[in-house]
């Protein structure tokens, strides 16, 4: 279909427009352009005949038009009167007519606008301001911007006069902003320079800072006054009603109790003529005493005693505060405060309650802290630890054992060998030991303050021969591709080398195998079924060596995708169908069958005697391993043909 596209549709005065023809028929006699929406000889602009290549101007030709061979019409130096419709009339070579109409609009280029205002210094909550965008231009859209944002929605903002006038009713200080107007038409847009609205306001009620009204004798009093105001306010200070000075700040050094009283700041705005005052009452106090903490139990026993801490001195109408470890009191059922907060009780103290503790007295002007107090909580002894952890020693070496038990006050230690007291020391030392030094070594820890004792026994074996080691495991039935297993070679022996074998071979190099703890521990990461082997550990020193019994790792795996046998899928009618399903799995999986989606028996073998074509369908074997929690399945299609209908069919079992 013949169409006309105006490029551009909206044309600026003085510019040009192209009436571009689309889908012009191929074989043409000629074409003609008309001003208006129809073919009218009196409004013909120009005609063009293909055969003669002759362009003939019409009555509406202005000399600004150029016609192109593709029938498009260029109009130059556009004037306002060019706005409207244009019709192209095409005569095809068979003298059949076609016509299409296009249009464009002409707009003037806009000048840069400016803003005029009816009030350059409006007063807050009193005046209105009307901004007008100049000049008035026909067919132009007027827009307004406040701080480069579009106008906010507000009942105090009103647009009128075709949006050319913006009125702000009852101006506020928040209307102090940058205002711009913009004129737009389809061919141009221009913004004015910004106009800053200067709203006179205030003064608001002044604010006196700092806010504290209580001071200590001897401090400096430095008060500052501020009131929001435009232009800035002028300030005056009054003490107990008597004028002091006309400054924004009031400074009195080294105040005394006599400086207590009412302090008034007055703010004045000379443009609005308004005054506002604020009064603050200042109290000057003499120096209060420093607090301290007393305790009802200086050496409480862990899990037995309670402790009451009291903040001294007792002062009426005083707020008491507490801190533990430089933090405010934690919430705990073991911490209790008295009604006046002066006494802090710790119920059933623990070794972690040592502190430090501080109390504070709060008065009108500050908080005074006590010195910190630390609680001496008696505890222990805990079960002693004997080090080193070796249990096997070679003859001729020195035996040096150390014992430690957490305790306050520190524990007193005693050593016993096979029940006989040896010495009252924390360390036991025997040089050049022999097999006779084998036995039970006991460490006893005693807390004299609490009267509690605790013991630990260790078996020491002195032998030239190393014992036969054994393997302990942290996971007896790991799952394939999921679990890790750590084997540890027991016992821990001094000056001993630990070795490992897998299936009688030394350890293979593998990123999944890791030795640690002086080679005493072998870790297998992400076990696989191939890790189900015999593991042996060995210990050796310069005089002997020994190997453990093998430990076989039982890796749980599967079930893998099952296999149905025999592989045949075509059977003759009358044959027996005997299908067997197998899946690699540890432990062995549970088997079940489905025929055409219908559950059958829970067996590894499916047997159907004398099958017929009715037994056609899908045979699915399902396997599940309860230990690994995994399932698998396979589907096989079985076709049963009537006897003798198709070659190559299995006769069945």
């Amino acid at each position: 279909k013949l169409t006309i596209e105006s490029t551009p549709f909206n044309v600026a005065e003085g510019k040009e427009v192209l009436l571009l023809v689309h889908n012009l028929p191929q074989h043409l006699f000629g074409y003609s352009w008309y001003k208006g929406e129809r073919v009218d000889g009196n409004r013909q602009i120009i005609g063009y005949v293909i055969g003669t290549q002759q362009a003939t101007p019409g009555p509406a030709y202005s000399g600004r038009e150029i016609i192109y061979p593709n029938a498009s019409l260029l109009i130059q130096n556009i004037i306002q009167n060019d706005t409207g419709f244009y019709t192209l009339h095409v005569i095809k070579s068979d003298l059949v007519n076609e016509e299409a109409t296009g249009q464009f609009r002409v707009y003037p280029e806009l000048p840069k606008p400016s803003i005029s205002s009816n009030n350059s210094k409006p007063v807050e909550d009193k005046d209105a301001v009307a901004f007008t965008c100049e000049p008035e231009t026909q067919d132009a859209t007027y827009l307004w911007w406040v701080n480069n944002q579009s106008l906010p929605v507000s009942p105090r903002l009103q647009l009128s006069n075709g949006n050319r006038t913006l009125t702000l009713f009852n101006v506020t200080r928040n209307d102090t902003a940058s205002y711009k107007c913009e004129t737009q038409n389809p061919v141009s847009a221009r913004r004015s320079d910004s106009v800053i609205l200067n709203v006179l306001y205030g003064p608001d009620a002044p604010t006196i800072s700092p806010l504290n009204t209580s001071y200590r004798s001897g401090e400096n009093l430095n008060l500052s006054c501020h009131a929001a105001s435009n232009p800035p306010a002028q300030y005056s200070w009054f003490v107990n009603g008597t004028f002091q000075q006309s400054t924004q700040e009031l400074f009195i050094p080294n105040i005394t109790v006599n400086n207590s009283g009412s302090y008034t700041c007055q703010a004045h705005n000379s443009d609005t003529g308004l005054n506002r005052t604020t009064v603050t009452t200042i109290t000057v106090y003499a120096e209060p005493p420093k607090p301290f903490i007393t305790s009802n139990n200086s050496n409480p026993v862990e899990d037995e005693d309670a402790v009451a801490l009291t903040c001294e001195p007792e002062i009426q109408n005083t707020t008491y505060l507490w801190w533990v470890n430089n933090q405010s009191l934690p919430v705990s059922p073991r911490l209790q405060l008295s009604n006046d907060n002066r006494t802090l009780t710790l119920l059933s103290v623990t070794r972690n309650d040592v502190g430090p503790y501080e109390c504070g007295i709060q008065n009108e002007l500050s908080v005074d802290h006590s010195d910190p107090v630390i609680l001496n909580v008696l505890y222990g002894p805990d079960d002693p630890t004997i080090s080193p952890s070796y249990t096997y020693y070679r003859p001729g070496v020195n035996l040096s054992l150390s014992c430690h038990a957490a305790s306050n006050p520190p524990a007193q230690y005693s050593w016993l060998i096979d029940g006989n007291i040896q010495q009252h020391t924390q360390e036991l030392f025997i040089s050049n030991i022999t097999e006779k030094n084998s036995g039970l070594y006991t460490c006893q820890a005693n807390n004299s303050a609490s009267g509690h004792s605790r013991t630990t026994v260790k078996t020491i074996t002195v032998s030239a021969e190393l014992p036969k080691p054994s393997i302990s495991s942290n996971n007896s039935k790991p799952v394939e591709d999921k679990d890790a297993v750590a084997f540890t070679c027991e016992p821990e022996a001094q000056n001993t080398t630990y070795l490992w074998w897998v299936n009688g071979q030394s350890l293979p190099v593998s990123p999944r195998l890791q030795l640690s703890n002086g080679n005493r521990t072998l870790t297998l990461f992400n076990v696989t079924r191939n890790d189900a082997r015999a593991y042996v550990c060995g210990i050796q020193n310069s005089v002997s060596a020994n190997r453990s019994d093998p430990v076989t790792l039982d890796v749980l795996y599967g079930p893998d995708t099952p296999i149905i046998s025999p592989p045949d899928s075509s059977y003759l009618s009358g044959a027996n169908l005997n299908l067997s399903c197998h899946s690699a799995s540890n432990p062995s999986p549970q088997y079940s069958w489905r025929i055409n989606g219908i559950p059958q028996q829970h067996t590894q073998v499916l047997f159907i005697a004398k099958i017929t074509p009715n037994n056609n369908g899908t045979y699915a074997c399902f396997v599940s391993n309860l230990a690994t929690g995994r399932n698998n399945s396979i589907v096989k299609s079985i076709t049963v043909s009537a006897s003798g209908t198709s070659p190559g069919l299995s006769a069945g079992a």
Epitope: G47, H89, I91
Partner: antibody, heavy 121, light 106 residues
């Protein structure tokens, strides 16, 4: 001065053939579209056919389509109408006419005086 | 095909009269309408093309108007030489004529 002169009319039996000619002068024939219009005795005008300046474009009224052929010889400034399978209703005065060089929309600005074709047994 | 209907078929008028002949198309033909005058024994003569454009050399008492389906030929002041038969022709496809209007002296 534009002149169009038709010839070749006469009496012909039904089913017979006739060839009309139109000699043109006074304008650039080779760049002008041409046409034939007929008028049965005592009846109105009926457009018959038209042809483009280069002969490649031809149009016919449904009543003559397949029987009449319009053609031109620009070297002789002559327009033709070959009429075959003539019928009694083809009896009319046949006018040769010119479409002007600024033809918006198509119209016939010069006509010949016509030639009479009578189809009768 | 587009049918053209002229009315009236015949018309009697006197010299100096204003005469109007109408032509109606069976479907819209935009401004593609021409008017012709034919005197007895003569070839037709073009008066108006494109519904309202006066052919060169035709007196200005002849005027045409209309678009779409309804068109009018007006003779503002009838002259003795104007008595003839008038045909409208649509310039669409095919270029069919109206049946004619015979203008006679009253």
């Amino acid at each position: 001065e534009v002149q169009l002169l038709e010839s070749g009319g006469g009496l012909v039996q039904p089913g017979g053939s006739l060839r009309l000619s139109c000699a043109a002068s006074g304008f650039t024939f080779s760049s002008s579209y041409m046409g034939w219009v007929r008028q049965a005795p005592g009846k109105g005008l009926e457009w018959v056919s038209s042809i483009g300046s280069g002969s490649y474009s031809t149009s016919y009224a449904d009543s003559v389509k397949g029987r009449f052929t319009i053609s031109r010889d620009n070297s002789k400034n002559t327009l033709y109408l070959q009429m075959n399978s003539l019928r009694a209703e083809d009896t009319a005065v046949y006018y040769c006419a010119r479409y002007p060089s600024v033809p918006f929309p198509p119209h016939l600005d010069y006509w010949g005086q016509g030639t009479l074709v009578t189809v009768s047994s | 095909d587009i049918q053209m209907t002229q009315s009236p078929s015949s018309l009697s008028a006197s010299v100096g009269d204003r005469v109007t002949i109408t032509c109606r198309a069976s479907q819209s033909i935009s401004s593609y309408l021409n008017w012709y005058q034919q005197k007895p024994g003569k070839a037709p003569k073009l008066l108006i093309y494109a519904a309202s454009s006066l052919q060169s050399g035709v007196p200005s008492r002849f005027s045409g108007s209309g678009s779409g389906t309804d068109f009018t030929l007006t003779i503002s002041s009838l002259q003795p030489e104007d008595f003839a038969t008038y045909y409208c022709q649509q310039a669409g496809n095919p270029h069919t004529f109206g049946q004619g209007t015979k203008l006679e002296i009253k």
